[in-house]
């Protein structure tokens, strides 16, 4: 049965329209030639930045060996969408597929890959390529996790107290401070799946004059600093 390799290969490139594009196609180790009738399913968790293009790949099997190629797409709150190509008749068929941004990369008889143009939060879900051969099926599944970069702000709201916010990130960002203070952190969950994290810190020690808020997120990290003034100071804002 097909077994996953330990190493994942993440390719990132720029397309002509300046939209970042990533493709996750991992090599698998075939450890036996005695194929079982239903071959092992390989699943990959894949974080993808919002507003990029994504390409999802099928197992590496030449068209001459195939009967049907099917992409099954399960998105939250929607009926399962299937895109199928039947080699014998050279026909493609779609069932319950409404998102026009999810398409075959090209003609399925030339390339079985699936592409998502301009990934949105709604593309969070499970994508599976099923390759039907005369001796069983090969599967490749992707748990697609759409990442949203939070907007980071840092400001002083009262004497020796600073507030750092990571607004509308997905998943939730993690906020830490240098130096550590007396902190309280709150999370606010939005209906679109994003989370706002708010960390409020107070420093009693008067020799602390500058504090740094460090925001860790899957899309990248960001640090902002502020001087603790007797009165509220200038507001700092930045994207990761």
């Amino acid at each position: 049965a097909a077994q996953p390799n330990n190493s994942l290969m993440l390719q990132t490139s720029k397309e002509n329209h300046a939209l970042a594009s990533s493709s996750l196609c991992m090599d698998e180790k075939q450890i036996t030639q005695n194929y079982s009738k239903v071959l092992a399913e390989v699943n990959t968790s894949w974080p993808v930045k919002m507003a990029t293009n994504a390409v999802l790949c099928c197992p590496p099997i030449a068209l001459r060996n195939l009967i049907i190629i099917t992409w099954e797409i399960i998105l939250r709150g929607q009926p399962s969408c299937t895109k199928a190509y039947k080699k014998e008749t050279n026909e493609t068929k779609e069932t319950n597929c409404t998102d026009e941004r999810i398409t075959w990369v090209s003609r399925p008889d030339q390339n079985s890959d699936l592409q998502i143009r301009t990934v949105a939060i709604t593309h969070d879900g499970y994508y599976r390529c099923i390759m039907v051969t005369p001796d069983g099926n090969f599967h490749r599944g992707y748990h697609l996790q759409v990442l949203v970069t939070p907007e980071v702000t840092l400001f002083q709201n009262r004497n020796r107290t600073a507030v750092c916010k990571a607004v509308a990130g997905k998943p939730a960002a993690h906020i830490s401070w240098i130096p550590e203070g007396d902190c309280a952190t709150k999370q606010e969950y939005w209906s679109n799946g994003t989370v706002t994290v708010k960390s409020t810190c107070h420093w009693e020690v008067h020799n602390v004059s500058t504090v740094t808020c460090h925001v860790s997120h899957l899309t990248g990290n960001k640090s902002l600093y502020i001087e603790l003034l007797p009165v509220p100071g200038a507001k700092k804002s930045a994207k990761l």
């Epitope: 196609c25 090599d27 197992p59 590496p60 014998e88 079985s112 051969t133």
Partner: antibody
């Protein structure tokens, strides 16, 4: 285990035809594409074409089109490669090889059949 | 058709040393993140034997002394360390749609 057994050596005259057989065992015969490759004495490997026993699809190397025919007999799990209008340069060892699905690699080969074309 | 060019044509290596064979394709044999390039070993009077598939995957039962690398158009087969019974011809092959082999590299052990 998976095995491919080819027919014995042949000696043919120029202009004649030869039909080489490749009998498969140890797996579901109709499930895997079979390729034919030849190797002239002291030379490299040359792909001739393939047959898919599942649906009888064939695809031949342009070089051999019109001269080569690949067929299969599902009752005996055997594929055949027939080459016509033989010339001396067709003298070679002819191999059948089974294509495994994953990666389209050839993991199982026949032992080879020597075809000698001589007047 | 894709043309595969192997180099060198022949190679003499001492036991324990490294042998490197390269294969260059006239156009990319990689698609969907996979490189449909395989390496075979052929000893006199025997059919070829699969060593490496999809550029870098070791076929079951093949010693780890054999390794493959590369993508796109440039590929390498490495034998390290070489042993006496590695004397053979080595062929690269691509298998995406129409298939071709490299012309072969003869490896001799000194």
């Amino acid at each position: 285990q998976v095995q491919l057994v080819q027919s014995g050596a042949e000696v043919k005259k120029p202009g004649a035809s030869v039909k080489v057989s490749c009998k498969a065992s140890g797996y579901t015969f109709t499930s895997y594409v079979m390729h034919w490759v030849r190797q002239a004495p002291g030379q490299g490997l040359e792909w001739m074409g393939y047959i898919n026993p599942y649906n009888d699809d064939t695809n031949y190397n342009e070089k051999f089109k019109g001269r080569v025919t690949m067929t299969r007999d599902t009752s005996t799990s055997t594929v055949y490669m027939e080459l016509s209008s033989l010339r001396s340069e067709d003298t070679a060892v002819y191999y059948c090889a089974r294509e495994d699905y994953y990666g389209s690699r050839w993991g199982t080969w026949g032992q080879g059949t020597l075809v000698t074309v001589s007047s | 058709d894709i043309v595969l060019t192997q180099s060198p044509a022949s190679l003499a290596v001492s036991p324990g040393q490294r042998a490197t064979i390269t294969c260059r394709a006239s156009k990319s044999v990689s698609t969907s993140g996979y490189s449909y390039m395989h390496w075979y070993q052929q000893k006199p009077g025997q059919p070829p034997k699969l060593l490496i598939y999809l550029a870098s995957n070791l076929e079951s039962g093949v010693p780890a002394r054999f390794s493959g690398s590369g993508s796109g158009t440039d590929f390498t087969l490495t034998i390290n360390p070489v042993e006496a019974n590695d004397t053979a011809n080595y062929y690269c092959q691509h298998s995406r749609e129409l298939l071709t082999f490299g012309q072969g590299t003869k490896v001799e052990i000194k």
